[in-house]
């Protein structure tokens, strides 16, 4: 499947639309500090010259790799040196290397202000003065903030973000059609991009056999009834998708999700039941409902794994003869009957399979040594099972902000050495499995919960890496990819740690509080929270509780004063100085 | 602040049993959730069992099915029933008590520890 002129080919298959999208995209994740009219005047001159080449595919430089175009139309941006520091030297590196220099120095917390809303009447006015420059912008200022962001999904996030403005600017009220609407496009891409962030993390970090075993899981419990051998070519279509977007091939990554796409449409019999309302969909809209298509029934008759996996006499003659086929299909088996597991669960079963055929295919009696195996599964199922209800009880009975709190306290005294920022972030978002998950019946409980957690703690080891201050930190997140939650679950008070000396400027808090949002105000409180655990880690749950409910009444009082700085200048040193003697 | 004491160790043969108590004294302690860890010599302390404020209980794989937690909450007491008791059960068995009300298996969710009671199996 040569093309004289890659670009050509992609510019063909795309469609201008798209296309530009997804090079705009492109250079945002790579330069994201660049300023936004710099990267529209790049994304022109490639789309001039892909034009070109649609024209004439044998015309100058149409023959050179979509890295060798994109790499040198980035190095020509003026200011890389003073802007980007030691990225600029990707410069004088050849292709692949270049491409890999940029990879490399993709930003996961670039130091970008926050996106200010402006007020729905601007929006609207800028929207109808000038729509493509508008949603130009939308794909820029995401890009460049999350620079692992899936391109062709951002381009469906794109498209509904368009139809919002379209419906909500006509409406009567305006307000109250758009916000909520931009509310939900704001929440979904977060965790969107969240969950593309640790797809890209396992390529990059563990490899494709890593997310090759994540996607049959997945793949399995979502299509129970499609054969192992469907599932092992949608597999293999996924993985190279994934491993294009993740590597910043986002045109072909693009292009390659829509034949994926067109694959399963036309083979919804052998896939899945469910497959139906997506297919009759426009192409962006179509692969995110693939994407996120809910798991179809499990066929009626499906027999006990034991006769295949633990009975059989022929269990190391076919492990041996092809290892990863037969764990494979073992993973695929386990993970059709189990929709109520966590996909990391699933694959922690697989590694334990796994561990005990190595052991007892060179035993003198395989057979014997092996027998119990699923025995062996037992206490890893009950471990996340338990950890959920737990936490859910926990969650019902606190309400999210106190059980975010709660999670605060709690990994502050695991790795204290993690940046205040970090601690806030990363808790807050592990308490959102609360009213995520916990509502769910029983059986979707637990992959709602672990996969979510899995998604929250990447994001904890990808800001991690790029300021590394723990050694168990590093030790969770690189050791495995699947036992990284527990990994974080089993950590204990760290007792080397040596508590952060006080500091009141920490603890003065002004009246400016007193303006923020309700949920500006929680990290605010949960900023304290944290400095206070790192100042005195081994203060008791009750201690700390007292405090906070201190803090709240301190600062409700002084929001309500009438002189609400003499307030604050006032009641905050009291405050610091009961909260000290309370934790003395 | 609540204060634990246990009580009930002591030396026994293999596959014999004990049974252990702890008392609180403090307020409300029908909200805690209370685990019993235990310590051997020159090892971390380890999560044996646990019952939370409701009365769920949770426990250690390698106790599964011979140790029995239980609470008297008009008492405010926990006991560890410990049945087929085995030379690896030996060490120092510690009552702990979250305010929460949870019956986690790490130790930084307990505030609050006893002395602890030492408990030899002896083959």
């Known amino acids: 499947d040569t093309h004289k002129s890659e670009v050509a080919h992609r510019f063909k298959d795309l469609g201008e639309e798209h296309f530009k999208g997804l090079v705009l995209v492109a250079f945002s994740q790579y330069l994201q500090q660049c300023p936004f009219e710099e990267h529209v005047k790049l994304v022109n001159e490639v789309t001039e010259f892909a034009k070109t080449c649609v024209a004439d595919e044998s015309a100058e430089n149409c023959d050179k790799s979509l890295h060798t175009l994109f790499g040198d139309k980035l190095c020509t941006v003026a200011t890389l040196r003073e802007t980007y520091g030691e990225m600029a030297d990707c410069c004088a590196k050849q292709e692949p290397e270049r491409n890999e220099c940029f990879l490399q120095h993709k930003d996961d917390n670039p130091n970008l202000p926050p996106l200010v809303r402006p007020e729905v009447d601007v929006m609207c006015t800028a929207f109808h003065d000038n729509e493509a420059t508008f949603l130009k912008k939308y794909l820029y200022e995401v890009a460049r903030r999350h620079p692992y962001f899936y391109a062709p999904e951002l381009l469906f996030f794109a498209a509904r973000y368009k139809a919002a403005f379209a419906e909500c600017c006509q409406a009567a009220d305006k307000a109250a059609c758009l916000l909520p609407k931009l509310d939900e496009l704001r929440d979904e891409g977060k965790a969107s991009s969240a969950k593309q962030r640790l797809k890209c993390a396992s390529l990059q970090k563990f490899g494709d056999r890593a997310f090759k075993a994540w996607a049959v899981a997945r793949l399995s419990q979502k299509f129970p009834k499609a054969e192992f051998a469907e599932v092992s070519k949608l597999v293999t279509d996924l993985t190279k998708v994934h491993t294009e977007c993740c590597h910043g091939d986002l045109l072909e990554c693009a292009d390659d999700r829509a034949d994926l796409a067109k694959y399963m449409c036309e083979n919804q019999d052998s896939i899945s039941s469910k497959l139906k309302e997506c297919c009759d969909k426009p192409l962006l809209e179509k692969s995110h409902c693939l994407a996120e298509v809910e798991n179809d029934e499990m066929p009626a008759d499906l027999p006990s794994l034991a006769a295949d996996y633990v009975e059989s006499k022929d269990v190391c003659k076919n492990y041996a003869e092809a290892k990863d086929v037969f764990l494979g299909m073992f993973l695929y088996e386990y993970a059709r009957r189990h929709p109520d597991y966590s996909v990391m669960l699933l694959l922690r079963l697989a590694k334990a399979y796994e561990a005990t055929l190595e052991k007892c295919c060179a035993a003198a009696d395989p057979h014997e040594c092996y027998a119990k195996v699923f025995d062996e599964f037992q206490p890893l199922v009950e471990e996340p099972q338990n950890l959920v209800k737990q936490n859910c009880e926990l969650f019902e009975q606190l309400g999210e902000y106190k059980f975010q709190n709660a999670l605060l306290v709690r990994y502050t005294k695991k790795v204290p050495q993690v940046s205040t920022p970090t601690l806030v972030e990363v808790s807050r978002n592990l308490g959102k499995v609360g009213a995520k998950c916990c509502k769910l019946p029983e059986a979707k409980r637990m992959p709602c919960a672990e996969d979510y957690l899995s998604v929250v703690l990447n994001r904890l080891c990808v800001l991690h890496e790029k300021t590394p201050v723990s050694e168990k930190v590093t030790k969770c997140c690189t050791e495995s990819l699947v036992n990284r939650r527990p990994c974080f679950s089993a950590l204990e008070l760290d007792e080397a740690y040596v508590p952060k000396a006080f500091n009141a400027e920490t603890f003065t808090f002004h009246a400016d509080m007193c303006t923020l949002s309700e949920k500006e105000k929680q990290v605010k409180k949960q900023t304290a929270l944290v400095e206070l655990v790192k100042h005195k880690p081994k203060a008791t749950k009750e201690q700390l509780k007292g405090v906070m409910d201190n803090f709240a009444a301190f600062v409700e009082k002084c929001c309500k004063a009438d002189d609400k700085e003499a307030c604050f200048a006032e009641e905050g040193p009291k405050f610091v100085a009961a909260s000290q003697a309370a934790l003395a | 602040q609540l204060q634990l004491v246990e009580s009930g160790g002591g030396l026994v043969q293999a596959g014999g049993s004990l049974r252990l108590s702890c008392v609180a004294s403090?307020?409300?302690?029908?909200?805690?959730?209370m685990g019993w860890f235990r310590q051997a010599p020159g090892a971390e302390r380890e999560f044996a069992a646990a019952?939370?404020?409701?009365?769920?209980?949770y426990y250690a794989d390698s106790v599964k099915g011979r140790f029995t937690i239980s609470r008297d909450n008009a008492k405010n007491t926990v006991f560890l029933e410990m049945n087929s008791l085995k030379p690896e059960d030996t060490g120092v068995y510690y009552c702990?008590?979250?305010?929460?009300?949870?019956?986690?298996?790490?130790?930084?969710?307990?505030?609050?520890w006893g002395q602890g009671t030492q408990v030899t199996v002896s083959s």
């Open positions: 403090g307020r409300s302690f029908s909200t805690y959730g």
């Open positions: 019952i939370n404020w409701k009365g769920d209980r």
């Open positions: 702990a008590a979250d305010s929460d009300g949870s019956a986690f298996s790490r130790r930084l969710e307990y505030d609050y």
